[in-house]
């Protein structure tokens, strides 16, 4: 089941999925001046069986100026640097990703892809939040969000994260600013069955990755 909404937005933070549950779809989009080849896929789909998951359909871009050709130009380093996504896409691949059953890794970049990747997540997907450069995290709970099914509707849990500018706080390192209640209903208000999958294993994975998943600087 696809999640109806996007993960919550946290001011001065970005999110990333460390692995993508089977059923996740990714827009096949090209950067300016390029377009999908006519017979090309609209979306990539994470699919697989119990032992192996991979992305079905390949995204292919061709120059808008040329006809009937799939000749592609390798992006220059400065073009690659300008890539940015709300999912904090990165070539970094945590090794733990591969061991999570029923999940796909971050798809490798395709030539001339758009600068932003748009994913369509499924129930059970977890994303992790990090403050952007120049801000630091104040949080009392997990800096992650999970897409859950509740009463037949999908929703994302609210990450317990506040990002504050370095100069905005007088606290000593490690001291937290008092935090207002997160937006949305507290979990305790949800009395009916909430179905999630592999929440525990992903939480464990997150804990083991905590010190390494966000080491790359995102511009």
């Amino acid at each position: 089941e696809l999640c109806d909404d996007d993960p919550p937005e946290i001011p001065h933070a970005t999110f990333k999925a460390m692995a993508y549950k089977e059923g996740t779809m990714l827009n096949c989009e090209c950067k300016r001046g390029f377009r999908r080849i006519k017979s090309g896929s609209l979306y990539m789909l994470c699919t697989g069986n119990s032992s192996h998951s991979s992305w079905d359909n390949q995204c292919q871009c061709t120059s808008s100026a040329t006809r009937n050709t799939t000749k592609q130009v390798t992006p220059q380093p400065e073009e690659q640097k300008e890539r940015k996504t709300t999912e904090m896409q990165s070539p970094m691949q945590p090794v733990d990703q591969a061991s999570l059953p029923g999940h796909c890794r971050e798809p490798p970049p395709w030539e001339n892809e758009a600068t932003e990747r748009i994913y369509h997540f499924v129930v059970g997907q977890m994303v992790y939040y990090q403050c952007v450069q120049g801000y630091r995290a104040l949080h009392r709970g997990p800096a992650e969000s999970v897409c859950k099914m509740t009463h037949g509707k999908t929703r994302w849990t609210q990450p317990q994260l506040i990002c504050t500018g370095e100069m905005e706080t007088s606290q000593f390192p490690g001291e937290e600013k008092p935090q207002a209640s997160p937006e949305g209903r507290p979990e305790s208000e949800t009395s009916c069955l909430v179905t999630t999958t592999d929440f525990q294993i992903q939480t464990e994975m997150a804990a083991t990755m905590e010190t390494s998943i966000f080491t790359t600087e995102y511009q």
Epitope: L2, D4, D5, D6, C28
Partner: nanobody
Amino acid sequence: EVQLVESGGGLVQPGGSLRLSCAASGRRFSTLIMGWYRQAPGKQRELVATIERGGTPTYADSVKGRFTISRDNAKNTVYLQMNSLRPEDTAVYYCKTLRYWGQGTQVTVSS
């Protein structure tokens, strides 16, 4: 779940025009790549046109110059303007996004 509802099909004479609409609900429309497909009797479903989030269109060779795909993100709707229609354009036209299909709308081009 995404719901797609097509409308605008009908019977038209060769050389005539029709405008198909596909209204989408259930997801943020501006994140979706939308496609129009068609299936003629006894034939496989084929891609007619697609439009990306930013409005970049792609067309099948058979309709290029005659059909125009567009989108209105404020109305959660994608359109297919079909001009200079030919008998071979007769088919059921479907709207598609992600893994979801609309129910289809019949277009018949006949004199």
